[in-house]
């Protein structure tokens, strides 16, 4: 499993972009098979982020090789039955680290999309996907969580109580000869998510659930989230009927609880509080929050919503505030540009997250042999001769100000400058006029002063003038 430049796809380059160490992480998104592959539609089947990822260090000038990826699994839980056909979207994100990163700290490097057919319970499928100059090698599989079985995880099976036969009226679970298919009729009200039955009109609970209808969660430790401790025998109780009970979301929408209420994630073509509104063309205005609708001129063609920064979802209905994580240090402004986050730093700070204090000599060195001087809560660079600017990165021309008077020629020199004076003039800057009768120079100069020979002077110091 690796991510890197593909063969014959242009000049090899490192994901780290020659800007120091970086970290890659992956976002995996599952969409229904009918979903448009190239669009930013809702990950209706599920989505997940990779967790532990190693830091890659790239040195400028090195040829970029594919980066080995850790074997850590990315688990994407899916709701309901496994559809068999689906769209698999894998986004590769780069997080730039280190002090010379520059630019946005996070960038979407590559996005591969492919429509796939896969039965649950099968072996790992290997895949290679290319996009632009990048190539991603990965494997994937679908598996059911017990007690679900089958290619679609739609049947509930339990181990047989006896090796030879299933319970009354129950058939063997093909192709699982050691398991029995659960009956279709359980006790009325038995939780379809947390209960099952091996005989009609019973309600057996899956691990972690209890109660006559398997609606009460069991906990051996402290109660999680909004659950409250119940009687000792029942463990933890939900405060009451959940807002998602019975799934209020229509048209295939999936429900999630949000602070006592619910929120529907609607499939493409539906929106509204309960996904009850159908609007499959751009004329219906399906894109919210300033999203730009593209395509979908008629009901048979799909539309795509291009969402502004801070919004996502097939209809730009989901507010996401990536800046709420406060990635910018030292009071920098976080700007969500959609494709990336950027930190704009306050004066005196720099770096992709404004992590470097420029007023601190430890923060950044002065270039070209300059020395850093701190004082009064700020820092400045004392530059070597021939260099200037805030960080001594600008080449200074000592002759630019025409320092040699009376037509003298200026020569840049390692220790400053040298003036070659015109006949009749002398001095460091040719400021003295020499009297033709051999009298004192004007203005007066010390007796015995001779005009320097710049050629011999330069040669003596083993430096050639520029």
């Amino acid at each position: 499993h690796s991510f890197g430049p593909g063969p014959g796809l242009g000049t090899p380059r490192s994901p780290c972009n020659a800007r120091g160490p970086c970290r890659l992480f992956f976002r995996v998104c599952l969409k229904p098979g009918v979903s448009q592959e190239a669009t930013e539609s809702l990950c209706a089947l599920g989505a997940a982020l990779s967790t532990s990822v190693p830091v890659y260090t790239e040195h400028p000038g090195e040829s970029a090789a594919a980066l080995p990826l850790p074997d850590g699994l990315v688990r994407v839980p899916f709701r309901d039955a496994w559809p068999g056909t689906f769209s698999l979207v894998i986004e590769t994100w780069r997080e730039q680290l280190g002090e010379h990163a520059g630019g946005p700290a996070w960038n979407l490097l590559a996005r591969v999309v492919g429509r796939r057919r896969l039965a649950a319970g099968g072996p790992w499928a290997r895949d290679v996907q290319r996009t632009g100059t990048w190539e991603l090698h990965f494997s994937y599989r679908a598996r059911c969580e017990p007690p679900a079985v089958g290619a679609a995880c739609a049947r509930l099976c339990r181990s047989r109580s006896a090796p030879s036969r299933c319970g009354p009226g129950l058939r063997p679970c093909t192709p699982f000869p050691d398991e029995c298919e659960a009956p279709s009729v359980c006790r009325p009200g038995c939780s379809p998510e947390h209960g099952y039955c091996e005989e009609p009109d019973e309600c057996r609970c899956l691990e972690g659930w209890t109660g006559p209808l398997c609606t009460v969660p069991v906990s051996t430790s402290s109660c999680l989230n909004s659950r409250v401790p119940g009687p000792a025998s029942t463990g933890c109780l939900l405060p009451g009927p959940g807002p998602c009970d019975g799934n209020p979301c229509a048209n295939g929408g999936s429900c999630s609880e949000t602070s006592g209420s619910f929120e529907c994630a609607c499939p493409r073509g539906f929106y509204g509080l309960r996904c009850e509104v159908s609007g499959v063309t751009c004329a219906d205005g399906p894109c919210f929050n300033g999203g730009l609708c593209v395509g979908g001129e008629d009901p048979d063609s799909a539309y795509v919503c291009h969402c502004p920064p801070g919004f996502q979802g097939s209809n730009c209905e989901k507010r996401v505030d990536r800046c709420s994580l406060q990635p910018c240090q030292n009071g920098g402004l976080c700007l969500d540009l959609g494709h990336a986050l950027r930190c704009r730093c306050r004066a005196g700070f720099a770096g992709p997250r404004c992590e470097h204090d420029l007023d601190d000599c430890a923060g950044r060195a002065c270039a070209n042999g300059g020395t850093c001087v701190e004082g009064g809560g700020s820092r400045r660079c004392s530059c070597a001769l021939g260099f200037g600017g805030r960080d001594c990165r600008e080449r200074a021309d000592p002759c630019a100000s025409r320092p040699c008077a009376h037509g003298g020629r200026c020569y840049a020199h390692f220790s400053g400058l040298v003036c070659a004076c015109a006949p009749g003039y002398m001095g460091v800057r040719c400021e003295f006029a020499v009297r033709p009768d051999g009298a004192d120079a004007v203005p007066a100069a010390p007796r015995g002063l001779r005009q320097a020979d710049p050629q011999r002077f330069l040669h003596h110091h083993h430096h050639h003038h520029h």
Epitope: G102, G103, N289, G290, P308, P309, G310, F311, D321, C323, S324, G331, L333, C334, L335, D336, L337, G338, R342, R344, C345, R346, A347, F349, A350, G389, R390, D391, R393
Partner: antibody
């Protein structure tokens, strides 16, 4: 289409106060950082202040720090600039503007308002 | 603070001329630079963003180049409606700073 409309300018005496407003429409106001920029008569442009989309982060030019306060009400799609201790040198046309960082994201309309004139004189 | 030095401050040119305006940043600003055009009594109009990207609706005779500290706005063939004042703006870091402006007048 993006539109920005400033109001609240006028004549005020030195030491006085004024509150400028900027009504925004045509884009998701709360997603974008906003700026105030001013231009003294016959002079160049000067950045005054910036506020983040959420309103949680604010930034000021040294010339107005401690006297001006930028704020926003995202429920009303409105940006504000409260100006106190006004001086003669604050006389200028004040523009509200969407932050230049978003110039490649938004299309159509004006990223700058038409401006409102603030005159500080006795 | 980053100083933006714009040159020339004023220039005379004729219709059809190629005009070049320069902005120099006192320290590197990557490509976080925008160019504006302003006519008397009007609002500044954005021409170029990200140093070299042409804003939609702006004629292709306008172009921007440069990165780091040296930036250039070029008008390939000056038109009558291009006589105006041009400003650069750096938005790499706070405080945001504008160039002093270049007034392009009719020769």
């Amino acid at each position: 289409e993006v539109q920005l409309l400033e109001s609240g300018g006028g004549l005020v005496q030195p030491g006085g106060s004024l509150r400028l407003s900027c009504a925004a429409s045509g884009f998701t106001f709360s997603s974008y950082a906003m700026n105030w920029v001013r231009q003294a008569p016959g002079k160049g442009l000067e950045w005054v202040s910036t506020i983040s989309g959420s309103g949680g982060s604010t930034y000021y030019a040294d010339s107005v720090k401690g006297r001006f306060t930028i704020s926003r009400d995202n429920s009303k799609n409105t940006l504000y600039l409260q100006m106190n201790s006004l001086r003669a040198e604050d006389t200028a046309v004040f523009y509200c503007a969407i932050d230049p960082e978003y110039y490649d994201i938004l299309t159509g309309g004006d990223y700058w308002g038409q401006g409102t004139l603030v005159t500080v004189s006795s | 603070d980053i100083q933006m030095t714009q040159s020339p401050s004023a220039m005379s040119a004729s219709v059809g001329d190629r005009v070049t305006i320069t902005c120099r940043a006192s320290q590197g600003i990557s490509n976080y630079l925008a160019w504006f055009q302003q006519k008397p009594g009007k609002v500044p109009k954005r021409l170029i963003y990200a140093a070299s990207s042409l804003q939609s609706g702006v004629p292709s005779r306008f172009s921007g180049s440069g990165s780091g500290t040296e930036f250039t706005l070029t008008i390939s063939s000056l038109q009558p409606e291009d006589f105006a004042t041009y400003f650069c703006l750096q938005h790499d870091s706070f405080p945001l700073t504008f160039g002093g402006g270049t007034k392009v007048e009719i020769k």
